[in-house]
């Protein structure tokens, strides 16, 4: 008789979960000197242990803690690079501007990047069926505790200027209900961070609108003078050209405003 | 001129109602973050609610959550508090004040007195 | 009880030199925006000081300083319309509130 199963409004853990952590740790392991220390079956054995045999609505910080602890890792605290709702293009910055870090270029962040995970209560399974979606079932289960863990942690760690990347597409371009608004924005240390400066993304060609103007981007700026963090916002209205830029700054066209 | 103008209080019996209102001018109100601050006859300030420009973040001092809900009209440049099951320690004179950024609440109505007591 | 402790009263003579303390914690203070306003007698707050900053009219006897978890407010040259409340506030992260002080009562003397 096939044992009851709870179904959950969410996508089920991503299949070959527990060998993509595992290749994804040996391959992270191999291209940063600086983390080769790391055993990965140990970093596996952490991150199963968070949520293997417990419920995946009540998941703690706690439970993450042993990964954390074996996952710990410096990056330079003033290249810190979040992102709100454009993870492409952060992702595809990152990777031309080498100095600079997102959450995904640390090893915690580029194991679990887009992968979903859950298990089920009182069993070692690992439940490919269905996870809890955040909205529909619950806000502590697995994969939103270890995102809102690791982030916390890497807004913690950030120092001096500190940028982020918003989506001015949106119609919230600064979302108090994104991990940025509900997480890292509240975690950034005053005594540390002197400025965050944000660059608003625009999506139309033509749209030469100052989106740093727009209420929401007031609203961040609001809270985060309270805080007594210097504030600034640039429009990138042309993303490409950006992106371009970056790769070859002394191109003639890149002295114009992007 | 920049101003508040607060107005809606008076003397309500324990357990009732009532709804203040604070309308902006002499700047663009949609920029700022919008506050509530009592005193009490004789005590100091205390702060009771605030609203954040686009009304997404909205807090409340203890001592009136789950009564007063603090909400804004930006297109009439009004801020309004819903108090209910007011109480003998909610009268005060109920300010307005706004929130500039880096500075603090530099625009302070002149007060509304709100008076519970049967 | 306030989040943050002022002396309940000062005073001064003309001309003199007076100093208001405020006493919080790395939660508000240490960290945050720390303001001063001054009530004069039967009117609204005034914002006196942001940051240890004037906002423009504020006479420069008034000036404002922070050490880790104390802020405070010195006027020199106290004149008679010094007389009123002067209350500090800062954001608290902890609470996610403002926080005033109980507010001191400068009398000059």
């Known amino acids: 008789v096939p044992r009851w199963r709870q179904q959950w409004s969410g996508p089920g853990t991503t299949k070959r979960f527990p060998e993509t952590v595992l290749a994804r740790c040996v391959k992270y392991t191999e291209i940063h000197p600086e983390m080769r220390h790391v055993d990965c079956q140990s970093v596996w054995d952490a991150f199963k242990g968070a949520f293997i045999s417990k419920h995946p609505c009540n998941i703690t910080e706690e439970d993450y803690q042993p990964l954390m602890k074996l996952g710990t890792q410096t990056v330079p605290c003033n290249k810190i690079l979040l992102w709100s709702r454009i993870k492409d293009l952060a992702h595809q910055f990152t990777q031309v501007q080498r100095d600079m870090f997102t959450l995904e270029d640390t090893l915690l962040g580029y194991l679990a990047d887009d992968l979903t995970w859950c298990g089920e209560f009182n069993t070692s399974k690992i439940n490919y069926q269905s996870c809890p979606d955040w909205r529909k079932d619950c806000s502590n289960n697995p994969v939103s505790v270890f995102w809102k863990t690791v982030s916390r942690r890497f807004a913690e760690a950030a120092c001096d200027v500190v940028h982020v990347m918003l989506n001015g597409s949106r119609s919230k371009i600064f979302d108090k209900n994104s991990t940025f608004g509900s997480v890292e924005v509240h975690n950034l240390q005053p005594e540390k961070v002197q400025t965050l400066e944000a660059w608003v993304i625009h999506g139309g060609r033509e749209d030469s609108r100052d989106l740093c103007q727009d209420p929401t981007i007031k609203e961040l700026e609001s809270i985060i003078s309270k805080r007594n963090i210097q504030f600034s916002c640039k429009n990138i209205y042309r993303p490409d050209k950006f992106l371009q830029c970056v790769k070859n700054p002394e191109d003639s066209s890149c002295t114009s405003e992007i | 001129e920049v101003q508040l103008l607060e107005s809606g209080g008076g003397l309500v019996q324990p357990g009732g109602s009532l709804r203040l209102s604070c309308v902006a001018s002499?700047?663009?109100?949609?920029?700022?973050?919008m506050n509530w601050v009592r005193q009490a006859p004789g005590k100091g300030l205390e702060w009771v609610s605030s609203i954040s420009i686009t009304g997404n973040y909205i807090y409340y001092a203890d001592s009136v959550k789950g009564r007063f809900t603090i909400s804004r009209d930006n297109s009439k440049n009004t801020l309004y508090l819903q108090m209910n099951d007011l109480r003998a320690e909610d009268t005060a004179v109920y300010y307005c004040a706004n929130y500039k950024s880096y500075h603090g609440m530099d625009v302070w109505g002149q007060g509304t007195t709100v008076t519970v007591s049967s | 009880q306030s989040v943050l402790t002022q002396p309940p009263s000062a005073s001064g003579t003309p001309g003199q030199r007076v100093t208001i303390s405020c006493s919080g914690s790395s939660s508000n203070i240490k960290n945050n925006l720390v303001n001063w306003y001054q009530q004069l007698p039967g009117t609204a707050p005034k914002l006196l000081i942001y940051n240890n900053q004037r906002p423009s009219g504020v006479p420069d006897r008034f000036s404002g300083s922070k050490s880790g978890t104390s802020a405070s407010l010195a006027i020199s040259g106290l004149q008679s319309e010094d007389e009123a409340d002067y209350y500090c506030?800062?954001?608290?992260?902890?609470?996610?509130?403002?926080?005033f002080g109980g507010g001191t009562k400068l009398t000059v003397l």
């Open positions: 002499g700047f663009t109100f949609t920029n700022y973050e």
């Open positions: 506030a800062a954001w608290d992260d902890s609470l996610n509130a403002w926080v």
